[in-house]
């Protein structure tokens, strides 16, 4: 799995959207966990709703969101004011029975204030080997890196 | 094993530049964030802002935005710090601390520091 | 700006007895704390985060509790090599800040 770059502003909202194979996870709930050491394991920090079918149903864990479009394929994690302690490597994941598969490795970047960085457009724009895709959220980028580029833990 | 190993000495005249440098060896340089904290003598730490070496996206404490510059070279696994329109408060230890990815804003690999002195 | 005061300013105290560090936030940081600990000429060394976590390779007479505002470092049996300044340091919002030490001393 690549991992890819979501960048959010401390104080404001970051949404992280995860695309899946619908047919393929038809069925599967979902879950958000945080990389918790080198080698630690994700911890979950919240799932969708216990019966697949309401599954586009929004819950909460603290600031963290999380709703899942069973029919498109997309898993959308939404945290609230982001602050920098919410910095790290997550993953989404689809739950089947006591495993996990990753459907995306996520990490996320905060930074102190928009104003303050104008330039991180200029600064995160890809390359040609890059895919680059918007988070459409306000003074949020995601970026698409390549296998390698950074090193992710395995999961447990 | 990680380390971080940091330029020498340097003496300045206040209005003049420094460019401070820390090279990292014994991990994966584009795996972790990069962080300047500065000490004064015989005074407390004061973080100044972090680099992502992968991206060479950066953030910077309020107090340095504009005489802050950070950059990296990820062809030598190098990171730099430049502070300009040096004053001689600037005069201090001035470190660079690696942040891991899981916590990236936790310092958990320091440099030795780099003393800056600032006088005319 | 979050403020982090910690107290005592000096700690004196004997090898073998038992060190208890404070830092108060100005606000609340959740558990998003750490500690660390520095010597004359040298950098400082991560020793806990998330307010009770020890890091790797930290020996187990080091401890770290507390949540919210209050935070406490403990060092149970004090080693000859502990005795230096300990900083505490929150990542809860920016711009990150540090405290303004505590010295242990030997007595």
């Known amino acids: 799995h690549n991992t890819t770059v979501f960048q959010g502003v401390a104080g404001q909202s970051l949404q992280v959207s995860c695309p899946y194979d619908s047919m393929k996870h038809w069925g599967r709930r979902k879950a958000w966990c945080r990389q918790l050491g080198e080698k630690g394991p994700c911890q979950r920090v919240v799932s969708t709703h216990n019966l697949w079918l309401l599954s586009f149903l929004r819950r909460w864990n603290g600031s963290t969101a999380i709703t899942d479009d069973t029919l498109g394929g997309t898993l959308t994690i939404t945290l609230r004011n982001l602050q920098p302690h919410d910095a790290g490597l997550y993953q989404c994941q689809s739950l089947h029975g006591s495993e996990a598969d990753t459907l995306r490795k996520v990490l996320v970047e905060v930074l102190a204030d928009p104003l303050d960085h104008r330039d991180a457009g200029d600064l995160w724009f890809p390359g040609e080997s890059e895919s680059f895709e918007d988070a459409h959220v306000e003074h949020s980028i995601s970026r698409s890196l390549l296998e390698g580029e950074i090193p992710f833990p395995p999961t447990s | 094993q990680v380390q971080l190993v940091q330029s020498g000495a340097e003496v300045k005249k206040p209005g003049a530049s420094v460019k401070v440098s820390c090279k990292a060896s014994?991990?994966?340089?584009?795996?972790?964030?990069m962080h300047w904290v500065r000490q004064a003598p015989g005074q407390g730490l004061e973080w100044m802002g972090w680099i992502n070496p992968n991206s060479g996206g950066t953030n910077y404490a309020q107090k340095f935005q504009g005489r802050v510059t950070m950059t990296r070279d990820t062809s030598i696994s190098t990171a730099y710090m430049e502070l300009s329109r040096l004053r001689s408060d600037d005069t201090a230890v001035y470190y660079c601390a690696r942040g891991p990815l899981y916590h990236p804003m936790i310092f958990d690999y320091w440099g030795q520091g780099t003393l800056v002195t600032v006088s005319s | 700006e979050i403020v982090l005061t910690q107290s005592p300013a000096t700690l004196s105290l004997s090898p073998g007895e038992r060190a208890t560090l404070s830092c108060r936030a100005s606000?609340?940081?959740?558990?998003?704390l750490a500690w660390y600990q520095q010597k004359p000429g040298q950098a400082p060394r991560l020793l806990i985060y998330d307010a009770s976590n020890r890091a790797t390779g930290i020996p187990a007479r080091f401890s770290g509790s507390g949540s919210g505002t209050d935070f406490t470092l403990t060092i149970s049996s004090l080693e000859p090599e502990d005795f230096a300044v300990y900083y505490c340091?929150?990542?809860?919002?920016?711009?990150?800040?540090f405290g303004g030490g505590t010295k242990v001393e030997i007595k």
């Open positions: 340091q929150q990542l809860s919002t920016y711009p990150l800040t």
């Open positions: 014994g991990y994966t340089f584009t795996g972790s964030y």
């Open positions: 606000q609340s940081v959740s558990s998003y």
